[in-house]
């Protein structure tokens, strides 16, 4: 299987993480997608998910997390605004494909949020007090409980199987964007043999 990698991002409290999860293939466009946190020794926990089927360009808000799926470009946009120190952790996007296990997207993000705000290069240092305006069409989707027969043997765990509903909702405020892309991991290729080995490297981060 493709080796999962992590990218570390160090942000200040109040900043915004803006992630583009690249799912690439049309067959995934309508699939429900989720943003998960992976805590050491635990299974991934779903913090937010799109609707099922996932709607095009239709923001879904769960607390300070906004998901927006752009079918025409194969991109899931994930924004975590007004970051807090306690948001630090390992995150990933997945695509739900029940009854199969979710398809993981990579690279995973190791987010480290530290106290105090200092503008990053290219950021707007005066935007700390700006209220993040959620589009009026924003909705909240219910995320499925997904249980897997797999056993977690790695640390940190790399299973994408077990997810649960979000347990907190927090206030929204905006600041600086840190932009990052993620690409499709080819677990689906291995399970269904749908894409040849020749294709696999094209889905990886260059």
């Amino acid at each position: 299987a493709t080796k999962l990698t992590e990218e570390k991002y160090e942000l200040k409290e109040g900043q915004t993480l803006d992630v583009k999860c690249d799912y690439t293939l049309e067959k995934f466009a309508a699939s429900q997608k989720a943003w998960q946190i992976i805590r050491d020794g635990e299974m991934p926990k779903t913090l937010a998910c799109t609707e099922r089927p996932s709607k095009n360009s239709h923001p879904v808000q769960v607390g300070r997390i906004i998901l927006e799926d752009y079918h025409d470009h194969g991109l899931l946009r994930v924004r975590m605004v007004n970051l807090q120190v306690e948001d630090s952790g390992l995150y990933q996007c997945v695509i739900y494909q029940p009854p199969k296990e979710p398809h993981m997207l990579f690279d995973r993000i190791r987010l480290v949020v530290t106290k105090g705000f200092s503008g990053t290069p290219g950021s707007n240092e005066n935007s700390t007090q700006n209220v993040y305006k959620i589009p009026p069409t924003t909705t909240k989707a219910l995320c499925p409980l997904y249980t897997s027969p797999r056993t977690v043997t790695q640390a940190p765990p790399k299973s994408t199987a077990d997810v649960s509903t979000p347990d907190s909702e927090i206030n929204l405020t905006n600041v600086t964007d840190i932009i990052r892309e993620q690409k499709l991991i080819s677990e689906e290729d291995l399970e269904q043999k749908l894409i040849s080995e020749e294709d696999l490297h094209h889905h990886h981060h260059h």
Epitope: K20, A29, H73, L75, E181, L184, L194, H203
Partner: antibody, heavy 121, light 111 residues
């Protein structure tokens, strides 16, 4: 190994019709959109059109120069894409390439060798 | 339609020297921070070959003397040290909007 092989080119009179085929192998054909690109002798590349996958209801898109005259289709069971060309004009004379992208609006990583279509009286 | 204009139309560079080709779009080819702009190399009698995708990503197997940069409407393909086998026509292409479009091509020769 991914392979795309075009066929069906040849000489046709103005106003005539021709159907090109693109036989694909080495990958899961149904997963990807397929495109046609053409190139007149000594000229640049011109995108002709694309056909998306079943997930997108086989939606098709065309360049303005061929819209209404050309039709792209596919048969996933035969791993083949087609370009039906009607009301051909002399300016349609070109090498026609079949190409496969790497996903939604992604780059053309694989190309066939092309098939020559000559429209002349 | 998005029009891609390459400059120059032709370019002669000495072996080992840097070659730079520009591509300007009539409107942005970006969606978020992704630039849906790609570069291809074509040699006589051959189909095009992908060099760079999404503005700056080097295609697997392509020598690292090739690089791409830019975003929005202005993009550049750079060959850091021209080799004899780099003589070809180079095309930029956008896939951000239908219809997809190509630049008119830049012919690269050795001085």
């Amino acid at each position: 190994e991914v392979q795309l092989v075009e066929s069906g080119g040849g000489l046709v009179q103005p106003g005539g019709s021709l159907k090109l085929s693109c036989a694909a192998s080495g990958f899961t054909f149904s997963t990807y959109a397929m495109h046609w690109v053409r190139q007149a002798s000594g000229k640049g590349l011109e995108w002709v059109g694309r056909i998306r996958t079943k997930s997108s209801n086989y939606a098709t898109y065309y360049a303005a120069s061929v819209k209404g005259r050309f039709t792209i289709s596919r048969d996933d069971s035969k791993n083949t894409a087609y370009l039906q060309m009607n009301s051909l004009k002399t300016e349609d004379t070109a090498v026609y390439y079949c190409t496969r992208d790497m996903g939604i609006r992604r780059q053309f990583a694989y190309w066939g060798q092309g098939t020559l279509v000559t429209v002349s009286s | 339609d998005i029009v891609l204009t390459q400059s120059p139309d032709s370019l002669a560079v000495s072996l080992g020297e840097r070659a730079t080709i520009n591509c300007r779009a009539s409107e942005s080819v970006d969606t978020f921070d992704y630039s849906f702009l790609h570069w291809y190399q074509q040699k006589p009698g051959q189909p095009p070959k992908l060099l760079i995708y999404r503005a700056s990503n080097l295609e697997s197997g392509v020598p690292d003397r090739f690089s791409g940069s830019g975003s929005g409407t202005d993009f550049t393909l750079t060959i850091s040290s021209l080799q004899a086998e780099d003589v070809a026509v180079y095309y930029c292409q956008q896939s951000n909007e239908d219809p997809y479009t190509f630049g008119q091509g830049t012919k690269l020769e050795i001085k």
